[in-house]
């Protein structure tokens, strides 16, 4: 498999058949598949060097692994997008052997002197062809030469098989399955041959190809493949329930932010709630996690403005649940990214010198910002797309707080909507779905560069759109939701999470 280790070294060779028998639309589809693969790999924060070859009668090398920009995923994608099927029109035979020889030449070193560390680089060849080579001879011989060059399969004690993976995608109207199978790697419990039909669900294909065991602690990563559970798709999501004898129970959501902490809303708890009465589950697991302590933001005080006629005041409505035992990260349990951390700098593929202010401008620009939250409906977790009103619609969004029960007598809405809040909901630019009571404490998320970054904590809403456990379809335009802006509680987050190795900027 493709081992995605941010500290490892890898070369990926993309080889695309542009011969007559492929056809223009299949060629375009294959290109799109490779673009998606480059993006998927880049989303892990790994920077392999890419080689890019198209071929028919002759190969054409578009990107050499030795080029300075070969590890710049955006630049390689640009080169790939600029390739046309017509580029091989004049000489449109199929010489797969010559194409693989071009790969061999990129792998080999000058004067046959291996450079220091050559044996630590993993090599991946992704060949997209119909297998109908009609000139140049059998391409399998070049695969053997490559194996020789990389000293694979020679030493029984150290066969080095995981340093070469050859994946073959069958593209085109007619595919010679025998030829394709012969070229691909053969490894136990791994799939190295894919058909056109597979390419309709690329996440499924990538799931078969990628080994992410070295990057399970990466924040904001998800798997969207069809066999995945709700928690593959939102592995940070935590369900919180507070049992109060003789008062029933309160349900909330939260987000895993580190191996020991879940971030949620302070209002989910009262000062009387004991740790043992708080149940937290993650990854869709049945068992509850043991709680060590709940840490409230020191400025949170729901009764803080009672004298001023404000029955409930949600400023600084955030809390961290510290777990007794360390979480074991896996594909269904992993953290979400937090603002102003090194993890988010890497997730957004920003320079290491990026400041907190620059992250803020990237994630919360002064405009409508596409975001999402996760809600549970009929025992299923579903993503709801909303827009954070952070530009010209911000004022009207915040003013609608006056329609919330108990806030109708508030003269100045900034008394309840402080600078700590983000506002979603309403009907412009689109009709936003609203949060329900049980969504409280869950993350408000920005999805960027294939990663998920939490920018807010769901706090309160103007209208209860979920009476009788059913989300109403028709809701008034003033149905707004308010979320604590994580950029506005950073000092607290940084202090409480200072031992969690998140690299707060």
């Amino acid at each position: 498999k493709i081992v995605l280790d941010p500290s490892g070294s890898m070369n990926i060779y993309l080889v695309l058949d542009g011969s007559d028998s492929i056809g223009a639309s299949n060629f375009t589809g294959a290109k799109k598949c490779l673009v998606n693969l480059i993006e998927k790999v880049a989303s892990y924060g790994v920077k392999p060097r890419y080689g890019l070859v198209t071929y028919a009668t002759y190969p054409k090398i578009w990107v050499k692994v030795s080029e300075a920009d070969s590890s710049n995923a955006d630049w390689v994608t640009k080169q790939l997008n600029e390739i046309n099927y017509e580029d091989h029109k004049l000489k449109s035979g199929t010489n797969t052997k010559k194409a693989l020889q071009a790969v061999y030449s990129m792998m080999s070193w000058p004067d046959d002197v291996p450079p220091e560390g050559w044996n630590r680089t993993r090599h991946v060849i992704i060949l997209m062809t119909d297998g109908l080579h009609n000139m140049g001879g059998d391409p399998i011989t070049v695969i053997d030469e490559i194996r020789d060059l990389l000293y694979i399969g020679k030493d029984r004690k150290n066969p080095r098989e995981d340093y070469l993976d050859v994946y073959v995608f069958g593209v085109g109207p007619l595919v010679n399955q025998v030829n394709i199978n012969a070229l691909a790697s053969k490894k136990d419990n791994e799939q190295h041959v894919f058909k056109v039909k597979d390419m309709e669900n690329l996440e499924d294909v990538f799931y078969q190809m990628i080994d992410e065991s070295q990057s399970l602690s990466l924040c904001g990563m998800v798997w969207e493949h069809r066999k995945g559970t709700d928690y593959h798709k939102q592995p940070w999501q935590a369900k919180i329930s507070v049992i109060r004898p003789s008062k029933g129970h309160e349900s909330c959501m939260g987000a895993v932010v580190s191996e020991y902490f879940v971030l949620t809303a302070a209002h989910c708890f009262t000062v009387d709630d004991k740790e043992h009465s708080i149940k937290v589950s993650v990854g869709g697991e049945k068992r509850d996690l043991e709680i060590e302590v709940v840490l409230f933001h020191p400025n949170y005080n729901i009764n803080g403005k009672k004298e001023a006629g404000i029955p409930e005041f949600y400023d600084y409505d955030v809390a961290l649940i510290k777990l007794k035992n360390k979480l074991k990260y896996g594909q269904t349990i992993r953290p979400i990214c937090l603002p102003c951390t090194e993890g988010t700098t890497r997730a957004l593929r920003l320079p290491p010198t990026t400041t907190c202010q620059q992250q803020k401008e990237e994630l919360l620009p002064a405009q409508d910002i596409k975001a999402l939250f996760v809600s549970e409906e009929e025992k299923k977790l579903t993503r709801k797309e909303v827009y954070i009103k952070n530009g010209d619609k911000k004022g009207s969004c915040e003013r609608d707080a006056q329609y919330a029960p108990g806030y109708d007598k508030v003269k100045d809405i900034s008394e309840v909507v402080t600078p700590r809040f983000l506002c979603t909901g309403g009907v412009s630019p689109y009709a936003d779905p609203n949060t329900c009571r049980g969504d409280s404490g869950g993350p408000l998320i920005v999805h960027k560069r294939s990663r998920f970054i939490q920018v807010g904590v769901i706090s309160w809403g103007v209208v209860d759109v979920c009476k009788n456990q059913k989300r109403q379809k028709q809701v008034p335009a003033h149905a707004r939701d308010f979320h604590i802006n994580l950029f506005q509680v950073l000092p607290w987050l940084k202090e409480k999470l200072q031992d969690e190795d998140l690299g707060f900027l």
Partner: antibody, heavy 121, light 92 residues
Framework: QVTLKESGPGILQPSQTLSLTCSFS??????????VGWIRQPSGKGLEWLAS???????YYNSDLKRRPTISRDTSNSQVFLKISSVDTADTATYFC?????????????WGQGTSLTVSS | GDRVTISCSAS??????LNWYQQKPDGTVKLLIY???SLHSGVPSRFSGSGSGTDYSLTISNLEPEDVATYYC?????????FGGGTKLEIK
């Protein structure tokens, strides 16, 4: 440009309450990412961070101190205050007010010239 | 004209979150270096910082008479923020 100026009583008797004011200009304490802190230096000794207050009204204190001070602010008048109740001779020091940009990669960018406090009976 | 290096050792790793300050004899304090090696604006380039993990240093190349001062390191990694005891620099 950024300036900070501390003011205080100069002399106090033991058990009295110390009230210090930092008046600043050139920035606003409601600007994202900015904070103001207090640092003290007993005569001939090193520097000790006491407390900080951030743009969002978060307050942080040095947990190693015997008696916790109280920090507060008046954003509209560009002032930050520090109170230490029941002072003793160990609180004799020069008290500095500093501007702090948020973030681990930052230092105390700008310092006031300090105000001297003597605690004596 | 000399070159001087002042060392600062932390009791645990501080991820390069280390700053250097200069306190002149009249008591005024200035930030010189932040985040181990970044020069604060307006500070002469003869000041430089380096280090990692627990060991850090401030180097002044080409000493000038106005460099007579006490130099403090300060960790910005974890609360409470703490300062080193200070190193007094005198010129012979």
């Amino acid at each position: 440009q950024v300036t900070l100026k501390e003011s205080g009583p100069g002399i106090l008797q033991p058990s009295q309450t110390l009230s210090l004011t930092c008046s600043f200009s050139g920035f606003s304490l409601s600007t994202f990412g900015l904070g103001v802190g207090w640092i003290r230096q007993p005569s001939g000794k090193g520097l000790e961070w006491l407390a900080s207050i951030w743009w969002n009204d978060d307050k942080y204190y040095n947990s190693d101190l015997k008696r916790r001070p109280t920090i507060s602010r008046d954003t509209s008048n560009s002032q930050v205050f520090l109170k230490i109740s029941s002072v003793d001779t160990a609180d004799t020091a020069t008290y500095f007010c500093v501007q702090i940009p948020y973030g681990s990669r930052n230092g105390f960018d700008y310092w006031g010239q300090g105000t001297s406090l003597t605690v004596s009976s | 004209g000399d070159r001087v290096t002042i060392s600062c050792s932390a009791s645990q790793g501080i991820n390069n979150y280390l700053n250097w300050y200069q306190q002149k004899p009249d008591g005024t304090v200035k930030l010189l270096i932040y985040y181990t090696s970044s020069l604060h604006s307006g500070v002469p380039s003869r000041f430089s910082g380096s280090g990692s993990g627990t060991d850090y240093s401030l180097t002044i190349s080409n000493l000038e008479p106005e460099d007579v001062a006490t130099y403090y390191c300060q960790q910005h990694s974890k609360l409470p923020w703490t300062f080193g005891g200070g190193t007094k620099l005198e010129i012979k």
